[in-house]
């Protein structure tokens, strides 16, 4: 019928599975005159074939690893062999079927890990190629640890991320790997395609040796120091030791200071070597280095923390010698006349720097004293009692105390009694006429003058003169500068003109008082003046359609998979290219033609989200101006992490004997995101031969109960493995251990002979 | 072989009309498009258009519109033009040319003429 | 319509000489043109398609090159049989348009 199988000559894409005989047609083309016959170019491979009345067809099977995608051309010619319509491009798309195994690129892999390593980074990595197409699960490769040897206590010290296929201590591995207990391992892995889903999936294995070796280079915790010490320096504060003898120590300051008051010697001990002011700096970050003889690291810079805590050694400070207020003759009662700001350089929001304010002395005391308050923590200065007379007293002087915990500082405020403000500001032009500019004038140029006058007091809040655009910026591309002196008000430029948006602006100035108008006075059209500025071209950068772009994956999107786009204008009209800057973890690539952004590598939410690159949009010819916006691609979860206890259980114990059965309660999480309803992780006992002596039971989505079934335990530890599902998709299982130790108990908490100190567990049950 | 054979010589009044043929004969007549081509003396061609006898499509040069009809006979492997409202103007050789081009060839080019036949428009 | 123009209308040469006969195109016509022969009183033969490949038959002397606009047909070791008129065709965009044509006379 015309449509699914037959039509006229037009780009299409058609999806037909490798492996499979030609069953049919792919299409029949029809010719419109003086189109008579069709003709087939592209990647043919020689299986593709069209007839002259426009049969397009295949002669053979297809293999999508030969060629995943036929990039064919399709055009109509006329009786002379001319094209008269086309070519237009027809996609072939090659579907997969799972026709190929996995295979390790090594049938054996070595590696070492550090005890001690942080868990879930990987150390080592095993890699396994599938030709079938991993966008689907023929090429969607599942990691597993099939045995570890030795398997202690029934503990997985490693494990696997099913699709890396990355190597990573667990945190039990972490823990308790220890190279004078047992120095190697050794790991069967295993491969499967369909992600491991499927009765029908191939397999493959390799094998993995491992050495451990010790490790503490540690990070020591953060340090406190009190400003101002008067001990002796140098002072020791903390330490750092490399694993190995004669690794020479160096401190790094990465934030340059001039002056760095730490040191460390060659044995790691760290110092400070001056006293601290928490006023000049409140902490220090900077990184202690081991590096060998030749000055090469030895390994990642260690992240040395100090606080300097606050003493209260400042006394407040006044905003400025004299604070300068105005007040008018017919202010009312409580009104606000300002607010003195005093400064403490003190940490904020402690007792050190909190202030209080207190009127000490008003001068005169006309017609009586008290005329002001002042709040007590805010600094607020209020007209307390009746309105003033500036032909009585035109001036007051108050001294003001600001105290903290431990200081007291006076400061001084002037306030003038100034005339009401009954006259409004006079335009000395209410059309200040046409300005014309070119788009690029510098930002801080002053493009126009005005003046206003005003018949009120001078010098005072009535007269001062605020100019202000109330009209034709909505931009804010321009501002006025009043000269306090004159009055005289200085346009100045203060974001970028811009010809494409506005070419011509018809701007409307207000010119007001700070002090507010007497009852009764308004302002009117003597107060407004206007003025038109015209806008020329100049060539500009592209710009952006939003200054952040962002887009949402998913974390496992096959290779190659468009995540987003941006798009950017030339307000000259020229063409554009894209790239991308920041691309620090090289997954992405952008097309430079259409701002088309695509995946390169595996995606990973766990190691961050969103992921943030920087796009530049450069002018193809012209000036190669560019300018730069932001892609933020918001990975969503994949269920790609095994489930975890949530935190460190050694230091569990029952008193011995255990005078009835008992229980604890354990929380279990993982890595992955759980929206709304949070995890629903099921638990188990990781094998059976722990039935006897325990059971677990489930709490709710994150804890469980382990119980003992019986008192009959000997006075020892016990490892207890359970395992824990995570019921997502696909569901990812981890095997826990928790040690349980029973023990004889004083007051409560285990009884160890001295000299047994190693481990004491530290929680009852 | 292929062979293009065209009518004879005609001496024709102006305003008449006239029919010149091109039989052809050594190919399959409807595979191959015949085309039209005007020669006056020491001058060069001029393409006055084609058709394609399998399907009678025909094509004109804009310039000889309303001046040329093509047509073709299947069952004597003949093509034909008409000129009509002929004028000293139209005084010419005319020739047929065979285009190589068949369905799957590349043979983009005239590979055989008739031997041309000489229009006069005289009174 | 694309105009096709051989600047030469005439050529003189003499037996065993050689001679380029030039062919120009209003505009680009990619690779389609065709050199055409046409000796006193006879109808044309094709010489050189494409624009560089020889017809069968066509001795090694004639030789074709060019594409977009200008093209070049060669004639090297002239015979005294080479006294004719030789016309370029362009088939790219219709309406198909002929050169003038360049006469070659033998001295």
């Known amino acids: 019928q015309e449509g699914k199988f037959s039509g006229p000559l037009k780009p299409m894409t058609f999806s037909i599975y490798e492996g499979q005989e030609p069953s049919q047609i792919i299409f029949q083309f029809k010719a419109n005159p003086p189109a008579v016959t069709f003709e087939l170019t592209g990647e043919t491979d020689n299986i593709f074939v069209i007839e002259r009345e426009g049969l397009l067809y295949y002669n053979r099977a297809l293999d999508r690893e030969t060629r995943s995608t036929h990039n064919l051309q399709v055009a109509a010619l006329d009786a002379n062999g001319i094209i008269v319509e086309g070519p237009v491009p027809i996609t072939i798309k090659v579907k997969d079927i799972n026709d190929n195994r996995p295979t390790f690129l090594q049938s054996k892999y070595e590696g070492s890990v550090r005890q001690n390593s942080r868990p879930g980074k990987p150390f080592l990595y095993v890699n396994a190629t599938d030709l079938d197409d991993p966008a689907t699960p023929n090429g969607q490769l599942y990691y597993q640890i099939v045995i570890q040897l030795p398997m202690i206590n029934n503990v997985m010290y490693f494990q696997i991320n099913n699709k890396t296929g990355a190597i990573s201590l667990t945190r039990e591995g972490s823990q308790e790997l220890n190279p004078a207990k047992n120095p190697s391992y050794n790991l069967v892995i295993s491969v499967k395609d369909m992600g491991g889903q499927s009765e029908n999936s191939f397999s493959d294995t390799t094998s993995v040796d491992i050495i451990v070796t010790e490790n503490i280079w540690k990070a020591p915790k953060p340090v406190e120091m009190v400003e101002n010490s008067t001990d002796p320096h140098p002072i020791k504060i903390t330490q750092v030791r490399w694993n190995d003898p004669g690794a020479q120590y160096s401190l790094v300051d990465k934030e340059k200071l001039p002056r760095f008051p730490f040191s460390i010697d060659q044995e790691g001990d760290i110092y400070v070597t001056q006293p601290l002011d928490r006023e000049e700096k409140d902490a220090y970050v900077f990184y202690a280095v081991a590096k060998d003889e030749y000055g090469k690291p030895l390994s990642y810079p260690l992240e040395i923390h100090v606080k300097v805590k606050d003493i209260n050694d400042n006394p407040p400070t006044c905003p400025s010698p004299v604070t300068v207020f105005e007040v008018q003759e017919n202010e009312r009662l409580g009104n606000s006349i300002g607010t003195l700001t005093a400064h403490d350089r003190d940490e904020e929001n402690t007792a050190n720097s909190f202030l209080n304010y207190r009127i000490v002395e008003q001068t005169p005391k006309l017609p009586m004293d008290g005329l002001f308050l002042i709040q007590t923590y805010a600094g607020m200065l209020q007209l307390a009692k009746q309105s003033l007379k500036k032909q009585d007293t035109p001036q007051y002087n108050l001294t003001i105390e600001v105290s903290d915990k431990d200081f007291k500082t006076l400061c001084f405020v002037q306030i003038n009694v100034i005339d009401i403000n009954d006259q409004i500001p006079i335009f000395e032009k209410s059309d200040y006429g046409n300005l014309t500019l070119a788009e690029d004038t510098n930002i801080g140029s002053t493009i126009l003058t005005i003046q206003a006058t005003d018949a009120d007091e001078p010098f005072t809040g009535s007269s001062k003169i605020l100019y202000h655009i109330i009209k034709g910026d909505s931009e804010g591309r321009l501002g006025v500068d009043t000269d306090p002196h004159t009055n005289t008000g200085y346009v100045i430029i203060k974001k970028p003109l811009d010809f494409e948006t506005a070419a011509v602006s018809n701007i409307v100035f207000k010119a007001e008082n700070p002090e507010p108008l007497v009852f009764g006075v308004k302002y009117n059209a003597s107060s407004f003046a206007k003025f038109t500025l015209i806008v020329t071209d100049v060539n500009e950068a592209p710009q952006f359609s939003q200054h952040v772009f962002q887009a949402k994956v998913s974390e496992d999107v096959a290779i190659g998979t468009k995540v987003g786009n941006v798009t950017a204008k030339d307000p000259e009209g020229l063409d554009i290219s894209y790239s991308l800057r920041g691309d620090t973890r090289g997954w992405l690539k952008i097309d430079h033609v259409t701002g088309e952004i695509f995946s390169v590598a595996p995606l990973d939410r766990e190691a961050g989200s969103p992921y943030r690159v920087q796009v530049v949009a450069t002018e193809v010819g012209g000036s190669s101006l560019s300018s730069v916006s932001e892609f933020h691609l918001i990975l969503m979860d994949v269920n790609d992490n095994p489930p975890r206890l949530a935190k460190d259980y050694t230091g569990l114990f029952f008193c011995h004997p255990l005078s009835a059965p008992g229980s604890l309660i354990f929380e279990a999480t993982d890595d992955d995101q759980h929206l709304f309803r949070g995890p629903h992780f099921t638990f188990s006992l990781g094998s059976g031969s722990l039935q006897n002596d325990w059971e677990v039971s489930k709490i709710n989505g994150t804890h469980a109960r382990l119980s003992t079934r019986h008192t009959e335990f000997e006075e020892r530890e016990y490892v207890v493995l359970i395992r824990i599902n995570d019921g997502g998709r696909p569901p990812l299982e981890g095997i826990v251990s928790l040690p349980v130790t029973f023990c004889s108990c004083v007051e409560g908490s285990c009884f160890r002979p001295a000299g047994h100190q190693t481990g004491i567990p530290t929680v009852g049950m | 072989q292929v062979q293009l054979q065209q009518s004879d010589a005609e001496l024709v009044k102006p305003g008449a009309s006239v029919k010149i043929s091109c039989k052809v004969s050594?190919?399959?007549?409807?595979?191959?498009?015949i085309h039209w081509m005007k020669q006056r003396p020491e001058q060069g061609l001029e393409w006055i258009g084609y058709?394609?006898?399998?399907?009678?499509?025909?094509k004109y040069n804009e310039k000889f519109k309303g001046k040329a009809t093509l047509t073709a006979d299947k069952s004597s492997s003949t093509a034909y033009m008409q000129l009509n409202s002929l004028t000293s103007e139209d005084s010419a050789v005319y020739f047929c040319a065979r285009w190589g081009y068949y369905f799957g060839s590349t043979s983009y080019y005239f590979d055989f003429w008739g031997q041309g036949t000489t229009l006069t428009v005289s009174s | 319509d694309i105009v096709m123009t051989q600047s030469q209308k005439f050529m003189s040469t003499t037996v065993g000489d050689r001679v380029s006969i030039t062919c120009k195109a209003s505009?680009?016509?990619?690779?389609?043109v065709v050199w055409y022969q046409q000796r006193p009183g006879q109808s044309p033969k094709l010489l050189i398609y494409?624009?560089?490949n020889r017809y069968t038959g066509v001795p090694d002397r004639f030789t074709g090159s060019g594409s977009g606009t200008d093209f070049t047909l060669t004639i090297t070791n002239i015979q005294s049989e080479d006294l004719a008129d030789y016309f370029c065709?362009?088939?790219?965009?219709?309406?198909?348009?002929f050169g003038g044509g360049t006469k070659l006379e033998i001295k």
């Open positions: 058709i394609y006898p399998r399907d009678a499509i025909t």
């Open positions: 494409s624009p560089s």
């Open positions: 065709q362009q088939y790219s965009t219709y309406p198909w348009t």
């Open positions: 050594g190919y399959t007549f409807t595979d191959h498009t």
């Open positions: 505009q680009n016509v990619g690779t389609g």
